[in-house]
Interface confidence: low
Amino acid sequence: MEPRAVADALETGEEDAVTEALRSFNREHSQSFTFDDAQQEDRKRLAKLLVSVLEQGLSPKHRVTWLQTIRILSRDRSCLDSFASRQSLHALACYADIAISEEPIPQPPDMDVLLESLKCLCNLVLSSPTAQMLAAEARLVVRLAERVGLYRKRSYPHEVQFFDLRLLFLLTALRTDVRQQLFQELHGVRLLTDALELTLGVAPKENPLVILPAQETERAMEILKVLFNITYDSVKREVDEEDAALYRYLGTLLRHCVMADAAGDRTEEFHGHTVNLLGNLPLKCLDVLLALELHEGSLEFMGVNMDVINALLAFLEKRLHQTHRLKECVAPVLSVLTECARMHRPARKFLKAQVLPPLRDVRTRPEVGDLLRNKLVRLMTHLDTDVKRVAAEFLFVLCSESVPRFIKYTGYGNAAGLLAARGLMAGGRPEGQYSEDEDTDTEEYREAKASINPVTGRVEEKPPNPMEGMTEEQKEHEAMKLVNMFDKLSR
Amino acid sequence: MGCTLSAEDKAAVERSKMIDRNLREDGEKAAREVKLLLLGAGESGKSTIVKQMKIIHEAGYSEEECKQYKAVVYSNTIQSIIAIIRAMGRLKIDFGDAARADDARQLFVLAGAAEEGFMTAELAGVIKRLWKDSGVQACFNRSREYQLNDSAAYYLNDLDRIAQPNYIPTQQDVLRTRVKTTGIVETHFTFKDLHFKMFDVGGQRSERKKWIHCFEGVTAIIFCVALSDYDLVLAEDEEMNRMHESMKLFDSICNNKWFTDTSIILFLNKKDLFEEKIKKSPLTICYPEYAGSNTYEEAAAYIQCQFEDLNKRKDTKEIYTHFTCATDTKNVQFVFDAVTDVIIKNNLKDCGLF
């Protein structure tokens, strides 16, 4: 049914005809996400009519139908202004049972109505800056947070929980004031850590789940995203012991997430959100990643369970296959691994053994090949200085921040970027701060060492002298040609 | 039958191994000597690399050394504001407040009379008022049309601190100073068993013998280019834009017979300035044929290709390109701040409508 016909039906006001028109429109457009310009004015007119009824109150019998129509039109940018008013937002918040001024609805809310209103709010907040501002002013986050805290006590359908969390994500992603509010005033980290534990269905001592079901995966990812939003600009501060304990507890849950698979093909995405959040944990809390007890079948190194570190390394390998979104794909996991390696000798030695094993192939340049080392060395000359810096920093820490060792594994040419940024082009401190980390040379390396060009990091025969056979005079003449060029350049 | 060695035989074998090892070590010593040539135009960020080495390698500049830079900081600051005022005349830009014209006249008088290494409160006041003027700021924003030291804003924004009578330049202030380098500055440093000799080549013609010794057996050339030079307008005496000038030299050096097997480390410096500029000044100013977008990634990649494509020996000669921001010596406790915004933006992008 065309929007004009629906609007006409609304204006006549005959209830059954209106409901039928709305239903027909909803059926036809349930999957419409782009709209023809030709009918734009009709849709705007329909939106205005819907808003006026919405603000006066929808009849209980047909609320879901009306809200579905509002949801469909809230996908249309040209209708956003109609819906993004204080009254409309308040009405939708009331139906979603998250309006702050209302007493909670005494009788149990109609979950279908609640769900439709949440979806409308998600669409509006995603697309309209005005709606974002009004939602922040209306403090919708307060009642949303309250409801998330009730999930343990009352059973809400998966979809309601998912859209509660999605709306929380949108509000915290788009509004710094809401972020602060949830973080400080509403104790968001504790609240959402608790919700994450509930969703994962684990107590920290248990073995990780083998596979997280689809619905739990969806909710867990929304929680991880909200936690990311509220912690990224807050945990750079020093944390006290009480907070540290909370973040460590969150760390144990994230450890579970890293080790668990997600239903469908969503494991990598699930791990991605987990790793992003790990990057926001205060550095001193990352030790939980190495605190898993050893058990049958776990990967042990120097008496420490390396399952989590190994899983992060596997995740990095997978991410390095990607060509787009490289920065946000690899920087978080690299920086988490870097910090683990910086602070924990067993982790550093394990990672070095995996990523920078003793050199054997000294005939190939370090950036050539498909080993993890080769891929990371390639990133050291990446156009994006953030990507380049995380990759170089990771390898540098694996070399115990020893410049000679770093050059040995990557070549001075590749290393020059980090060394310049760190002011270490000429060596810096004589050795890294990890003096107890020795480096083993293979027989192949020792044999070839004299022929390795430190700049390229591979064996190269001594080239013939291009000036062979020239007289001193001729050499001077050639040299002066170069000098004149340099002179021109430095003027 | 088993093969056994007499005591003398064993000793002889050991001696022979020892001689081999000594020979190998001598060979290694020679082989492990790395000769670097540091090249780059006046404002390419080349001298910053040398200064950074000093800062970290030799525990930084001592307070005494920093004090010696005070005069350079003052001179750089005064020269910067003078360059802007002069350019206002050329670009026909008026002061926002007419009273600043008196300050400008006063600036030339006071600057001429200033004692080296000192800045009077009167001179500091004049510079501060001028720098705040909207006309001066408008002219500063057009600095690509005249020659202006990159550190102008750094010093002028910090005038209150710099003009204090007891001012001692910080390491960062020293990094920002600009002094014309001449001749060859040789730096030696050792990484364990690697002995590096770096020759920072200024443009002065000293005895020829010294030059030859400089160019023979070079392991790598460090070539510095200021990315932010791409949009600088030619001064009257210049034949080509500074970026093209750098490319021309890079071409000559990269393919020069002295450097047939010499790797090149190409530092594309001042990426921070470039990132700011590219939003306002299109890359076509420098490369009219460029058809990409004016985003940092695409434009920077294009410049990188322009330089790397000059290498005529791609199979045997390596070019290692690094995008750098030469004044960043902060040894960051590594967190991925730079990435968080991108993560949130992408998470938002992935939120479809319902």
Epitope: F33, D265 | G352, F354
Partner: nanobody, 126 residues
Framework: QVQLVESGGGLVQAGGSLRLSCEAS????????MGWFRRVSGKEREFVAA????????YYADSVKGRFTISRDNSKNTVYVQMNGLKPEDTAVYYC???????????????????WGQGTQVTVSS
């Protein structure tokens, strides 16, 4: 930029089969989620099927589930949709589309695709 060109449309009897192809040029399409949409004149464009960058996951509209199969060959930069058991209501212009959005979003909601082909006509006669 990715340029998309569809081919393989035509006239077919109800119950018959067709295989549409979509070749991508420009940037490598292997990092894109690819999809097929269709439009009956005067109606909204309707989602048909989508496939993730590696080809390991697919997703279909209810109306074509079990009859249509989407696949891709990244070495040829080509995406296919095999349409069996065609019905008159499948008559439409079929468009190929590409997006860099994450695949799961396409399953949970209907996102905008970034790049579109010109379309190829499929007519199913009864």
């Amino acid at each position: 930029q990715v340029q998309l060109v569809e081919s393989g449309g035509g006239l077919v009897q109800a119950g018959g089969s067709l295989r549409l192809s979509c070749e991508a040029s420009g940037r490598t399409s292997s990092s894109y989620v690819m999809g097929w949409f269709r439009r009956v004149s005067g109606k909204e464009r309707e989602f048909v099927a989508a496939i993730n960058p590696t080809g390991s996951s697919t997703y279909y509209a209810d109306s074509v589930k079990g009859r249509f199969t989407i696949s891709r060959d990244n070495s040829k930069n080509t995406v296919y949709v095999q349409m069996n058991g065609l019905k008159p209501e499948d008559t439409a212009v079929y468009y190929c589309a590409a997006t860099r959005r994450d695949f799961y979003i396409i399953r949970n909601s209907r996102p905008q695709f970034d790049y579109w082909g010109q379309g190829t006509q499929v007519t199913v006669s009864s």
